[in-house]
């Protein structure tokens, strides 16, 4: 189940990052406090998701890697809320 969830998240993550035009959007995410509680740095542009590395992506910049993890974390939170909402709504029917 966790693998399926990871798969869905990674797919959504890839689409979002590919669509981001994205310095602005990323910076707004980071400004809203998406970065890690002990890690993080302020925004830079996203790049198309091409090469994969582990669960995340390949990037040569460590700050960009952190930014991408922050976006992924944000998406996980958003998707998680949506999923919980759907389950709630189903329960009401």
């Amino acid at each position: 189940r966790r693998d399926v969830a990871h798969g869905i998240l990674n797919e959504a993550y890839r689409k979002v990052l590919d669509q981001l035009s994205a310095g602005k959007h990323l910076q707004s995410l980071v400004a809203r406090g998406v970065g890690g509680s002990l890690g993080g740095g302020a925004g830079d542009d996203a790049e198309p998701l091409s090469k994969r590395h582990s669960d995340g992506i390949f990037t040569d910049s460590y700050s960009r890697y952190r930014k991408q993890m922050a976006v992924k974390k944000y998406l996980a939170a958003v998707l998680g809320k949506r999923y919980k909402q759907r389950v709630k709504n189903k329960g009401r029917r």
């Epitope: 509680s37 890690g39 925004g43 910049s61 992924k72």
Partner: antibody
């Protein structure tokens, strides 16, 4: 205050593996970038890799690719670094370190791994 | 990988005198986010390293103000304005801008 406590010293045979642990306290463990750095006796520092526990996402130094595995157990706030196919040159003190502001702000006390036949 | 070259390898300075350590990177450490991820660590015998300076010039809280970092791009300097006995240690620069993260070879600071 974040604290990192590492497992004790190990003596290993060439060709074997070692697994070093690093237990974190005083912070949100899953939401940190946990790095591993080693230091051979009388030598400088060498970055081995990192893990972001929330997604179990890892990044390894090219030099150690295929030989190092970094994992994390969120339930115990513990990170692990396993190094396989050990050789004498792997004799070193292994440190875990937590990133803050893109720099290693917190360090474990170090774990000496001795590789000897 | 980015090569970090530190100089000198060792340095003997009289108490109260200035100590200067240089660090040169093989590529600019200015990141796309506008920050320069050049860091300085202090390591005393038998101890783990300790962060002194990050972002090239930001002093870690609790670090005495005799320690200062400067530089940009590829050339950086750590200065100890007035050397104290407790400053005897090995100092390392390292870069956190590019993977793989890399360290300088270290500079041993001793009292003359």
């Amino acid at each position: 205050e974040v604290q990192l406590v590492q497992s004790g010293a190990e003596v290993k045979k060439p060709g074997s593996s070692v697994k070093v642990s690093c237990k974190a306290s005083g912070g949100t463990f899953s939401d940190v970038y946990m790095h591993w750095v080693r230091q051979a006796p009388g030598q400088g520092l060498e970055w081995m890799g990192l893990i972001y526990p929330i997604f179990a996402d890892t990044r390894y130094a090219q030099k150690f690719q295929g030989r190092v595995t970094i994992t994390a157990d969120e339930s115990t706030s513990t990170a692990y670094m396993e190094l396989s196919s050990l050789r004498s040159e792997d004799t070193a003190v292994y440190y875990c370190a937590i990133d803050q502001d893109g720099s290693f702000a917190y360090w474990g006390q170090g774990t000496l791994v001795t590789v000897s036949s | 990988d980015i090569v970090m070259t530190q100089s000198p390898d060792s340095l003997a300075v009289s108490l109260g005198e200035r100590a200067t350590i240089n660090c040169k990177s093989s590529q600019s450490l200015l990141d796309a986010d506008g920050k320069t991820y050049l860091n300085w660590l202090q390591q005393k015998p038998g101890q783990p390293p300790k962060r002194l300076i990050y972002w090239a010039s930001t002093r870690e809280s609790g670090v005495p103000d005799r320690f200062s970092g400067s530089g940009s791009g590829t050339d950086f300097t750590l200065t100890i304005s007035s050397l104290q006995a407790e400053d005897v240690a090995v100092y390392y620069c390292w870069q956190g801008t590019w993977f793989d993260l890399t360290f300088g070879g270290g500079t041993k600071v001793e009292i003359k």
